[in-house]
Interface confidence: low
Amino acid sequence: CKAMHVAQPAVVLASSRGIASFVCEYASPGKATEVRVTVLRQADSQVTEVCAATYMMGNELTFLDDSICTGTSSGNQVNLTIQGLRAMDTGLYICKVELMYPPPYYLGIGNGTQIYVIDPEPCPDSDF
């Protein structure tokens, strides 16, 4: 397993609708044709997998249908969007990139993006 550098922004603020987007960029040492991107959430020293997708270079990024993540790829950049976030989801979101194919296998883990989520106050005229 060979190491690879992965860059991602330090801080992102989720929108009032609970959507956060950030770019995960990796320094590809070779011509990868199959790439796997995993988003991990670290909070209170616990690490959990948020979502993952395998994609072929030049093809769209396909998460599972029930995933809270969507994304697009362009070259060595992956534009990730996480939806449905609430205040309790605030935490460090780490981008993990694996160059699966062809060998050699490369693994890169970013330093993480701190996503802050603030639950919106209900509007006075709403039905809440």
């Epitope: 044709t33 199959e34 395998t54 072929m56 699966m100 194919y101 062809p102 060998p103």
Partner: antibody, heavy 123, light 107 residues
Framework: QITLKESGPTLVKPTQTLTLTCTFS??????????VGWIRQSPGRALEWLAL???????RYSPSLKSRLTITKDTSKNLVVLAMANMDPVDTATYFC???????????????WGQGTLVTVSS | DIQMTQSPSSVSASVRDRVTVTCRAS??????LAWYQQKPGKAPKLLIY???SLQSGVPSRFSGSGSGTDFTLTISSLQPEDFATYYC?????????FGPGTKVDIK
Amino acid sequence: QITLKESGPTLVKPTQTLTLTCTFSGFSLSTSGVGVGWIRQSPGRALEWLALIYWNDHERYSPSLKSRLTITKDTSKNLVVLAMANMDPVDTATYFCAHRNIEYRRSYFFDYWGQGTLVTVSS
Amino acid sequence: DIQMTQSPSSVSASVRDRVTVTCRASQDINNWLAWYQQKPGKAPKLLIYAASSLQSGVPSRFSGSGSGTDFTLTISSLQPEDFATYYCQQANTFPFTFGPGTKVDIK
């Protein structure tokens, strides 16, 4: 010991949908890196790769046939199903399912094959 | 799609002959090439993967070489059970593509 076996109709009519099942043993499609592919061979002709499904539910299709193909898996029953819509006489072929070789991490060679099933498309 | 060509399309040989089959890719596929053997009415059998790696259980008289666009399958001493059709397959880029095959028959 890895084994695969294809099953399905031997004769389909033009415009119908062909559904083939690959039943396998000796491996699990929930194991990271595992995949099952479908390849066909028209009488007296070369091999043509059709589709592949990964352990993680991701699918890949031959671009020329993508609009007609659907590949699914049932991990608990150890089977993979290929559906091919709008069959035509030119689709007459022997259809094979095969296990993706994972000796090299993430590879795309097929190291175990089923015996194949001959499908004839005719009215 | 990457086009795969093989030569010769057929070869007549005798037992204990050295047989060489070549495969050419229309673009660079690194070493992501496999060789399969197929006998009539049977499924293909993987012989060589990653251009030169011998699949488990395959006799050592089979060997593969090459990188980039040009590849070779060699049978060092042909045995009666080797009379079959041989196909190459590229696995560098989707869609995977196979060569048209080389038939090895008895002289």
